[in-house]
Amino acid sequence: QSSERRVVAHMPGDIIIGALFSVHHQPTVDKVHERKCGAVREQYGIQRVEAMLHTLERINSDPTLLPNITLGCEIRDSCWHSAVALEQSIEFIRDSLISSEEEEGLVRCVDGSSSSFRSKKPIVGVIGPGSSSVAIQVQNLLQLFNIPQIAYSATSMDLSDKTLFKYFMRVVPSDAQQARAMVDIVKRYNWTYVSAVHTEGNYGESGMEAFKDMSAKEGICIAHSYKIYSNAGEQSFDKLLKKLTSHLPKARVVACFCEGMTVRGLLMAMRRLGLAGEFLLLGSDGWADRYDVTDGYQREAVGGITIKLQSPDVKWFDDYYLKLRPETNHRNPWFQEFWQHRFQCRLEGFPQENSKYNKTCNSSLTLKTHHVQDSKMGFVINAIYSMAYGLHNMQMSLCPGYAGLCDAMKPIDGRKLLESLMKTNFTGVSGDTILFDENGDSPGRYEIMNFKEMGKDYFDYINVGSWDNGELKMDDDEVWSKKSNIIRSVCSEPCEKGQIKVIRKGEVSCCWTCTPCKENEYVFDEYTCKACQLGSWPTDDLTGCDLIPVQYLRWGDPEP
């Protein structure tokens, strides 16, 4: 499959946009050095490739957007892995370098004669990739060549830093916002003691750092924080689960700033160790409402509360996608491989026939079966439209009164394109306004999802709330059937009247033992007992002292 990575999807045009999608899963630990990618992906891969191809068709047939200019693309596979994505980005850059040299008349053959070789058009911008860690690596390269990058799901806070990532923009908000949303959920249910897990890599690390910082300010204690790679082996996930179990029964809630495949790894370990139902997972948007995370492990995932970027399904994409067939879809070079993987059958007589499948694919197969649209489809399409609107605005200002590419726009100047992109403001695919702040970020709107058992062996994600620019709304009755069902995740119970908290050395502030004050002491504050002065005694509620009334003894009084 090493050669599979070199496969590229092309669509011709006057201006070429690059794209990086995770057409295949990332390499497993043992295959990383070979950069050998995993199995083909539908939602994160094939659907995004098709979204790019079809969205460009729609843009090209829209007479009001870039009239007389055809947009084309070059789509490459990132395999959700930095090394693979960098290798592919170098290919984008190489195209740009060759064509810019050609513009300057520098393309010469070895024997000195002029070249009739017509190089590929340069890439003017790049859509993607999905992962923050990978996006950072790609941006480090692209910005050296002034190539703007628009991400559709890379949400790391680090990417907001324009001194480091000048040519990076995104149609999604920064993770600082969802970290806040997660803390708000923890606060709502009075979970003061939680375990924390994050995916190793930028998305998880920066997100969890923000979650921990915000938690500390809100008096929420982290029992322990763990990190793990998405592609870690079974044993690593087992060890992590055993560590999380060591904080039970106190830390029932596990906040997971994780990629979807990390969550899946946790669920699989729960199955292997017989731990279904022992934890409540609070997951970030890496999990969201993805079925590929929970498939086969629904029992372990039940009760999970997740954050999902607000993005409704795109109907016109489904209308296009569900009609696709391997006999007619030749422009997507990964489609035959995907079809065989999706239906576990062999496309007999096709160039990419896979002999590992015994069953032959029949003609009645359709993508309508168990179809689930990629939850980030709207963002992928908005990122492509952003690039188109940026180019459109640039054309309007550089080529006034001219339809098509004028000389002033050739070759496309990345600096001017970035300027134009940052000013972009249009109505997105779901009717929301797409705009960018000074950091190239988009505003934060999230849905809160809850993974529930809806009937016998039927599970689904239910929308139970929203978080919009700092305001959390939750339907508590939908999450918990009754108040008493609300999970407790606390280290220590409140102390009773007349007791103070004693925090053991090295323990977090949420864990204490309750000690009663002495007979002549009152509770000065939650950590201190103070003795009443001579002649006074603790009040009934033990919060202060009252003077002892003076009683004078008379000769005839009986003995007390």
Epitope: L248, R272, G277
Partner: antibody, heavy 121, light 106 residues
Framework: QEQLVESGGGLVQPEGSLTLTCTAS?????????MCWVRQAPGKGLEWIAC???????TWYANWAKGRFTISKTSSTTVTLQMTSLTAADTAAYRC??????????????WGQGTLVTVSS | ALVMTQTPSSVSAAVGGTVTINCQAS??????LAWYQQKPGQRPKLLIY???DLASGVSSRVKGSGSGTEFTLTISDLECADAATYYC????????FGGGTEVVVK
Amino acid sequence: QEQLVESGGGLVQPEGSLTLTCTASGIDFSSGYFMCWVRQAPGKGLEWIACISPYSDNTWYANWAKGRFTISKTSSTTVTLQMTSLTAADTAAYRCARTMAIGAYNPFKLWGQGTLVTVSS
Amino acid sequence: ALVMTQTPSSVSAAVGGTVTINCQASQNIYSNLAWYQQKPGQRPKLLIYDASDLASGVSSRVKGSGSGTEFTLTISDLECADAATYYCQGYYSGNAFGGGTEVVVK
């Protein structure tokens, strides 16, 4: 002192049903350790039947036990095992056991003495 | 389903000697294996967990080793009190016991 005591065993007719009870003393169910049933036919080896989480009431069964055996928590100190469609092959000493750690798949740290179930006409 | 195969079914050794019992798992269970000792009419007693960790109160003459699918229990300096049946238990993706090994001390 931590202790598990089983009761409810006895002679039962083939195709009959029986409910066994395990009563825990000196054990705090809130610690989260799972309660399980293991049986041992006369002169034979140990055979795991089922486990239950005292926290979630989730249950785990050996494949052969699904459908005929039901483990449940009836109070904060008792766990039962309901057995139906019994055959001679189910004749065994049924023991209650507590896991060493939280989770259905764990070593068994504490065992009951067992209650004998005899299936015979 | 997880299946544990224990060998031999019976072994005898003299006082002061050593016995070795093997246990094989039908799938990789890493180190998720326990060993028990059971004497007639008594409940099983946990000796080893996580393949090699000694349970509290167990003599250091008892040693567990192995990982993956192959495991071994070794009892050295045999005493008369070691005469019992020993069981292995795999606890990974299920619970399963081996058939048992009877240890006779001469």
